[in-house]
């Protein structure tokens, strides 16, 4: 046969040769020839390549910059990049997690529907009728209004989404 024009999986075509790609964690030093194999070298410390490749340089591991609120969630290997996450109370601004912002607090009248994580912000919801929140918080849910009846009291002041009801004693009819 003549030299190939297409190659198998995990191979690449160069100078009419099908050469083996370098495995993850290794970079290309020299292409194969008619007489020699592809030559690959392991990536150095703090470097990686995560696919079968013909790259002549490995990629640098991501740096989790503490000045941006980042910390290492998973240390990189020669085959994987470092995964960053945010310090407690902060979350990533993007999927790539290149910087962090402080978790949002839910204003009075709103409660926490879902507490923030390292990668997602706080989700707030308006307090429905019968519930209130009188604080700005990243953790507090809407609280139910106090039930005056169960305390043998009556409502003296109606509740809102920001305030609880005010209970008072029942008026006693004089004999």
């Amino acid at each position: 046969p003549e030299p190939p024009t297409a190659c198998r999986e995990k191979q690449y075509l160069i100078n009419s040769q099908c050469c083996s790609l370098c495995q993850p964690g290794q970079k290309l030093v020299s292409d194969c020839t008619e007489f020699t194999e592809t030559e690959c070298l392991p990536c150095g410390e703090s470097e990686f390549l995560d696919t079968w490749n013909r790259e002549t340089h490995c990629h640098q591991h991501k740096y989790c910059d503490p000045n941006l609120g980042l910390r290492v969630q998973q240390k990189g290997t020669s085959e994987t990049d470092t995964i960053c996450t945010c310090e407690e109370g902060w979350h990533c601004t993007s999927e790539a997690c290149e910087s962090c912002v402080l978790h949002r607090s839910c204003s009075p009248g709103f409660g926490v529907k879902q507490i923030a994580t390292g990668v997602s912000d706080t989700i707030c919801e308006p307090c429905p009728v019968g519930f209130f929140s009188n604080v700005s918080s990243a953790f507090e849910k809407c609280h139910p209004w106090t039930s005056c009846e169960t305390k043998d009291l009556v409502v003296q002041q109606a509740g809102t989404n920001k305030t609880d009801v005010v209970c008072g004693p029942q008026d006693r009819l004089r004999a």
Epitope: P1, S20, S30, D31, E34, F35, T36
Partner: antibody
Framework: EVQLVESGGGLVQPGGSLRLSCAAS?????????WNWVRQAPGKGLEWMGY???????NYNPSLKNRITISRDTSKNTFYLQMNSLRAEDTAVYYC?????WGQGTLVTVSS | DAVMTQSPLSLPVTLGEPASISCRSS???????????LNWFQQKPGQSPRLLIY???NRFSGVPDRFSGSGSGTDFTLKISRVEAEDVGVYYC?????????FGQGTKLEIK
Amino acid sequence: EVQLVESGGGLVQPGGSLRLSCAASGYSITSNYYWNWVRQAPGKGLEWMGYIRYDGSNNYNPSLKNRITISRDTSKNTFYLQMNSLRAEDTAVYYCARLDYWGQGTLVTVSS
Amino acid sequence: DAVMTQSPLSLPVTLGEPASISCRSSQSLENTNGNTFLNWFQQKPGQSPRLLIYRVSNRFSGVPDRFSGSGSGTDFTLKISRVEAEDVGVYYCLQVTHVPFTFGQGTKLEIK
């Protein structure tokens, strides 16, 4: 087109040494490939002697290992064969080769 | 070392007829990647060797398609589908999977 040109052959005294040159053109000897020396005694077959790689490292035929050195001068795009303690059996045509391209050969005669 | 044994050592052929040369290795020439570095060379009288086939079955550029190579592991064959007068010479197999590289003894093809 790759071209290889040997020089340095001739008559050598037994016990003497030789230094053959191989000037490469059309391709850098530092780019890739292994740059070989192969010899052929009169009326005999081919014998691989050794190579110098594109990165400067070597491999030699164990039968000759203690007597030969392959080196290079990258500025001249040339590689060399140094051979010591020559004997009559070393009389041969010496070829430099990338294996897909060969020099024309240079005759070395070991005789007193 | 991988010892390469060619047969026959002499091959008289009629013009236009096919010819076949065998090359056997004392050890497998397939490497860990599944590649086999077995090559065939032609050497005409008074000339340098010329690469015909590399990696068992790949024809080198400019080689007529009447030349073909096959085989695997330890057994390899060079075939000439229809011999022409210009094919006269000595044919060598060479393995470069293992160091030292080793040639077969050569097969002399002549016209009957």
